[in-house]
Interface confidence: low
């Protein structure tokens, strides 16, 4: 039987001769050279050679355990004479023995990590890891210990885990943001003679809100014209905050001051400035200076830093309102005046008033916008604003006159204002009533007395306060001996009645009745209108059958035959 089972061989042999591995030996070997030893398997004949007579095995090259830790070979012992095996072929192994020939290597050449500024001591930052290719099961060649070479006193590393932690209280990003830490990993449990590797860890402190906003000055002053409309920006203020990102965001507000309701402050999200804007219309003549207290505060606060003080700051903002040359202001937005239509030229109707609202109180002159009074019916006293007529009026032609009056600063003609002026022309009884239409009627030859043949209506261009009251009568020259009568209905109408039984169209075919219409106003106005009555032949139902047409060409006027 074979007298071996496995061999051990030290890796990385540096001797000049081949490295002796061991000896294959069969108890059938009598030492007379009758047996031949044969080696096959991993590296046989190349890496490993055997003396076929003695069975001595040697390694021809340096072996590296980290490359191949175990070699499996087969041994044979053959009788040289017969060529037959004297032992069954058997497998054996060569184990490569480890030496500490590999240093620890970190998984990254450079690590990057962040940790909040002001973090508590012992706050986890990052874990680094190094691996050692040597045999972890034998000795301490692969036992790695971590230590910090650079980065104290700010950071520490746990020797066994490679966990880096903060080691200093109150590390302030605003003071220093970047740290470079060098970590060493050493094998042999860190003992002398151990191999080592290093890595760099770049650590950045991230921002926390540990700084309040601060105004660089305690007082700001701005100017704005009184005419600035609401929303007009008049100045910018900026508080600085040493933090970054949302921790440096600032909200501005007006917390106090006499102009609290006159101004607003809005935050410009891009620049983190506070923009002071006009909230309500300003008036230099009412108030010329405003003082505000503006506060800048952080909207995102970390409660654990409240002990550092309030995260806000205040400044005083003084706003000076500049006078602007404003146009004159009328005492009313519109004026309504009245004048009788019989007013003489140069009659004063009323007046308008405007004044310069500026502190200077510049004098004002008045004029009529001629585009609104093309016929130059009205005029205005340029000094006192009195409106007077320059032509005669007629209510029946135009009831309302809508004109525009301009007030202009004498010292600055560009500063002008306009106001509408509505002038109502009041009625005077200067028109007589007239027939509402041309009246032409007929009467049957066989008509009976007191028969109504026509109802009369009248119109009057005037517009009396108590309404129209017309009276109707035959003209005096036609009243006596007339063939017809006028009946006044007292409701602004009248009827024409027959006065006799029967008319003869051959004797008188047409009657012209002069009717006087009067109104009941002062002074009384009257006119005479003519009604044409034609005599016609009628059937027994009273339907007209034939009439003479001469009346159609008769001039309107009086007829002695009425």
């Amino acid at each position: 039987s074979w007298m071996w089972n496995q061999f051990f061989l030290l890796e990385e042999y540096t001797g000049s001769d081949y490295q002796y591995v061991g000896k294959l030996h069969s108890d059938q070997d009598r030492g007379d050279g009758s047996l031949k030893y044969i080696l096959s398997g991993d590296g046989a004949g190349d890496l490993f050679i055997i003396n076929e007579n003695t069975g001595d095995i040697q390694a021809t090259k340096r072996l590296d355990r980290e490359e191949k830790p175990v070699y499996i070979l087969r041994a044979q012992a053959i009788n040289r004479r017969t060529g037959r095996p004297v032992e069954p072929e058997s497998e054996f192994i060569i184990k490569i023995h480890d030496i500490n020939d590999n240093e620890p290597i970190f998984t990254k050449d450079v690590y990057t990590a962040t940790v909040p500024e002001m973090a508590d001591v012992g706050t986890f930052v990052v874990q680094v890891t190094a691996t050692d290719a040597d045999d972890p099961t034998y000795g301490n060649s692969a036992k790695v210990v971590y230590s910090i070479l650079q980065g104290q006193p700010y950071f520490s590393v746990e020797s066994e885990t490679g966990i880096i932690k903060t080691a200093l209280l109150n590390m302030d990003r605003e003071n220093r943001e970047q740290y470079q830490v060098v970590i060493q990993a050493k094998d042999m449990g860190g003992q002398m003679g151990g191999l080592s590797g290093t890595t760099t860890v770049n650590i950045t402190l991230t921002d926390v809100n540990d700084n309040p906003p601060r105004f660089p000055q305690s007082t700001y002053q701005f100017k704005t014209p009184e005419s600035s409309p609401p929303g007009t920006p008049i100045g910018r203020i900026k508080a600085s905050d040493a933090d970054v990102g949302e921790n440096a965001e600032i909200e501005y507000s007006i917390t106090d001051g006499e102009g609290h309701d006159m101004f607003d402050v809005i935050t410009d999200q891009e620049t983190q400035e506070g923009i002071i804007t006009v909230k309500k219309l300003l008036d230099f003549e009412k108030k010329r200076v405003y003082t505000l207290k503006v506060e800048a505060s952080n909207p995102h606060i970390e409660p654990r830093f409240l002990y550092l003080g309030p995260f806000k700051d205040s400044a005083t903002v003084r706003i000076v309102v500049d006078d602007v040359d404003e146009p004159p202001v009328f005492s009313k937005p519109a004026y309504i005046l009245q004048i009788r239509e019989d007013a003489q030229i140069n009659t004063t109707i009323g007046s308008v008033a405007a004044q310069d609202p500026d502190a200077a109180r510049n004098p004002v002159k008045y004029s009529v916008d001629r585009h609104t009074d093309m016929d130059r019916i009205f005029n205005i006293d340029s000094g006192n604003g009195s409106i007077f007529t320059s032509k005669l009026l007629d209510r029946e032609t135009l009831l309302w006159h809508n004109i525009t009056v301009i007030a202009t600063e004498i010292n600055n003609p560009k500063q002008s204002s306009r106001v509408p002026l509505y002038i109502k022309v009041l009625d005077v009884n200067d028109n007589a009533p007239e027939f509402a239409e041309f009246y032409e009627t007929f009467v049957c030859e066989k008509a009976k007395a007191d028969q109504l043949i026509q109802t009369l209506h009248a119109v009057d261009k005037d517009d009396p306060y108590s309404g129209h009251q017309f009276s109707f009568s035959l003209a005096p020259e036609a009243a006596s001996g007339s063939n017809f009568t006028i009946q006044d209905n007292k409701d602004n109408t009248a009827g024409i009645l027959t006065r006799k039984n029967g008319y003869n169209r051959h004797e008188m075919s047409t009657y012209l009745l002069p009717v006087v219409i009067s109104d009941n106003d002062y002074p009384v106005q009257s006119s005479t209108g003519t009604v044409t009555v034609r005599v016609c032949a009628c059937d027994h139902h009273g339907n007209m059958q034939s009439c003479h047409a001469e009346a159609l060409i008769h001039p309107t006027g009086l007829s002695t035959g009425a």
Epitope: P225, P229, G231, V324
Partner: antibody
């Protein structure tokens, strides 16, 4: 910064309608009066109309050639000015600009200048 | 209505003074504004209220209003000032532009 951007232009047949928009940014839109001004190809500037701010009544005025056909409106919640054009004629072909009235430059009523203009949008009326 | 009349064109050598007029019978009563327009661009306000200059407009631009004429003056004219110039005024709520003047900078 103040920006005015017109949109909605294009080709339309005579008698047709078109609605232009003008999107504003960079200023307090609701405090300002705004104009529409047009420019026919190779010609000068022609005023179309104006709309005042709501605080000043929000009233509109129009040039005689467009009165009754064009309507100006504004949506202060969207910072947008509109021009509704109806019964379009070939002579309405032009680049249409919106312009802001500057209330901080001048204090004389109607007489404000136009301090910011958009780049314009082309309206072509053709059959 | 107000009417504003401008010369169609004005030529000037670089460095010289250019004057563009705007005439109308209502000019003494109403303020005049001036706009510059370069090809393919929107108008830019260069003078307002007869003689005031907006911020960002060079000092060489000035304006005046006398009698029935408003004048835009560009002293020390530069090549970049070549553009169309429009006067504008407002009367009775109606905005009116002049017909425009093409300023050519020679050379």
């Amino acid at each position: 910064q103040v920006q005015l951007v017109e949109s909605g232009g294009g080709l339309v047949k005579p008698g047709g309608s078109l609605r232009l928009s003008c999107a504003a940014s960079g200023f307090t839109f609701n405090s300002y009066a705004l104009h529409w001004v047009r420019q026919a190809p190779g010609k000068g500037l022609e005023w179309v109309g104006r709309i005042k701010s709501k605080t000043n009544g929000g009233t509109t005025d129009y040039a005689a050639p467009v009165k009754g056909r064009f309507t100006i409106s504004r949506d202060d919640s969207k910072n947008t000015l509109y021009l509704q054009m109806n019964s379009l004629k070939t002579e309405d072909t032009a680049v249409y600009y919106c312009a802001r009235v500057d209330a901080t430059y001048s204090y004389s009523g109607y007489y404000y200048p136009m301090d910011y203009w958009g780049q314009g949008t082309l309206v072509t009326v053709s059959s | 209505d107000i009417e504003l009349t401008q010369p169609p064109s004005v030529s000037v050598s670089p460095g010289q003074t250019a004057s563009i007029t705007c005439s109308g019978d209502k000019i003494p009563t109403y303020t005049v504004h001036w706009y510059q327009q370069k090809p393919g661009q929107a108008p830019v306000l260069v003078i307002y209220d007869d003689n005031k200059r907006p911020s960002g407009i060079p000092e060489r631009f000035s304006g005046s209003n006398s009698g029935n004429t408003a004048t835009l003056t560009i002293s020390g004219t530069q090549a970049e000032d070549e553009a169309d110039y429009y006067c504008q005024s407002t009367a009775s709520g109606t905005v009116v532009f002049g017909g425009g003047t093409k300023l050519t900078v020679l050379g």
